[in-house]
Amino acid sequence: EKSDLRTVAPASSLNVRFDSRTMNLSWDCQENTTFSKCFLTDKKNRVVEPRLSNNECSCTFREICLHEGVTFEVHVNTSQRGFQQKLLYPNSGREGTAAQNFSCFIYNADLMNCTWARGPTAPRDVQYFLYIRNSKRRREIRCPYYIQDSGTHVGCHLDNLSGLTSRNYFLVNGTSREIGIQFFDSLLDTKKIERFNPPSNVTVRCNTTHCLVRWKQPRTYQKLSYLDFQYQLDVHRKNTQPGTENLLINVSGDLENRYNFPSSEPRAKHSVKIRAADVRILNWSSWSEAIEFGSDDG
């Protein structure tokens, strides 16, 4: 890691150290410890206090971003005395050199693109590298395919998402021969960054009085079940005047996705298309291909 760690400690130090790869803060165990706690304070003065590990000489921070700089603190009491130690974790390097405008999206159920822009004060020879760790911290994924702009990595394409979990930690490090480059990190939920494909297998069957639309839920990266989906149907009469309102119908996901609506013969030519979203986020997919039914002389 490029960041330097500075310790602020009294004479008898706890030797506090932080491993950013595992997000583990550890210190030298003291004999006859009666109390210990660890926490961090960020630049906005928010405090995060994780549970202590079983050995009580370390703690692991789960959901934290470090790029704005944080201060770790450890308090230990023994039967003889008390210890306190701070550990500054700054984002060293020149201000404004870190990757910016970072975003990722999952598409086609098993592909992901992340993009970023070079920092405004980054030198010409800057190079960025993306690392992803899942919430269980069991695996680090290095970007397999970089997207480049004039030789600088400004994005990443992943075609194997098996190492991801529902929440993941993204780290963009930078290197340069000229100056130190700051890092950027972010926590992203897969459910918030997935763009669904439209529903598949859309069919329309009509009898003399009704038409029944059926469809299949889209394949997604997240393991979603039928109640997690919301659908919108656009039933559209062909050859209507411009500006005529389309009929948008909201349908909740079900085991058998269907929508039955009255439409008596002879029926004019209509088209129907469907889109899907996560019921909690309503991030709509693109529309499915329009399916036509009815006749021109209806």
């Epitope: 997240q222 079940s225 109640l227 997690d228 085991l255 909690r280």
Partner: antibody
Framework: QVQLVQSGAEVKKPGASVKVSCKIS????????IHWVRQTPTKGFEWMGG????????VYAQRFQGRVTMTEDTSIDTAYLTLSSLRSDDTAVYYC?????????????WGKGTMVTVSS | QAVLTQPSSVSGAPGQRVTISCTGS?????????VSWYQQLPGTAPKLLIY???KRPSGVPDRFSASKSGTSASLAITGLQADDEADYYC???????????FGGGTKVTVL
């Protein structure tokens, strides 16, 4: 219409095992996730386990670990629950259900239940 | 002893509004994990009424609504009807137990 048809009531002796089946009709089991829940008058509903997408495998409730096995035969759209080393407090109605949403999980629909009585 | 706490019974006259509370802790409802609600008519299997804290599956009347705040959730039934007489259960996920947990159930009586 999707239905879950469960096997009939069972009477077992303490220490024995019981295997409850749950046949899915109207849908392919391979596209569904099944969870099992039991209900007793004293303890109410107890979730026993089912498919967990985060782990990508069947997970079991801690209190049944080592005694319960959940299996599936997708060729006949049937899920099975086996509970071993039965005790009298395992007397309950055992339900299979389909996961409507993994968040919770929300279960819909449920089978009609299988009464298992453990008595010497 | 159920992990989620519900009142054992509530009652109301036809047409009235009744609410059922469900109190959990920081490892389940307050974590925050989603809450589901089920209705169980006598001698039948449970039926899902609410999922994702406040969403109704198709076929569930809009007389049933739910909300969640902090470590507790509640189910409201408006325009109470005789066939609402049943047991109602809340459910959530509990991270300390690594599994789904239920409330002890609330019997709704229509007077």
């Amino acid at each position: 219409q999707v239905q879950l048809v469960q096997s009939g009531a069972e009477v077992k002796k303490p220490g024995a095992s019981v295997k409850v089946s749950c046949k899915i009709s109207g849908h392919s089991l391979s596209e569904l996730s099944i969870h099992w829940v039991r209900q007793t008058p004293t303890k109410g509903f107890e979730w026993m386990g089912g498919f967990d997408p985060e782990e990508n495998e069947i997970v079991y409730a801690q209190r049944f670990q080592g005694r319960v096995t959940m299996t599936e035969d997708t060729s006949i759209d049937t899920a099975y629950l086996t509970l071993s080393s039965l005790r009298s407090d395992d007397t309950a109605v055992y339900y299979c259900s389909i996961v409507g949403s993994f968040s919770g999980p929300a279960l819909r629909p449920w089978g009609k239940g299988t009464m298992v009585t453990v008595s010497s | 002893q159920a992990v989620l706490t519900q009142p054992s019974s509530v009652s109301g006259a036809p047409g009235q509004r009744v609410t059922i509370s469900c109190t959990g802790s920081g490892s389940n409802i307050g974590a925050p994990y989603d809450v589901s609600w089920y209705q169980q008519l006598p001698g039948t299997a449970p039926k899902l009424l609410i999922y994702h804290n406040n969403k109704r599956p198709s076929g569930v009347p809009d007389r049933f609504s739910a909300s969640k705040s902090g470590t507790s959730a509640s189910l409201a039934i408006t325009g109470l009807q005789a066939d609402d007489e049943a047991d109602y259960y809340c459910q959530s996920y509990d991270s300390s137990l690594s599994g789904s947990v239920f409330g002890g159930g609330t019997k709704v009586t229509v007077l």
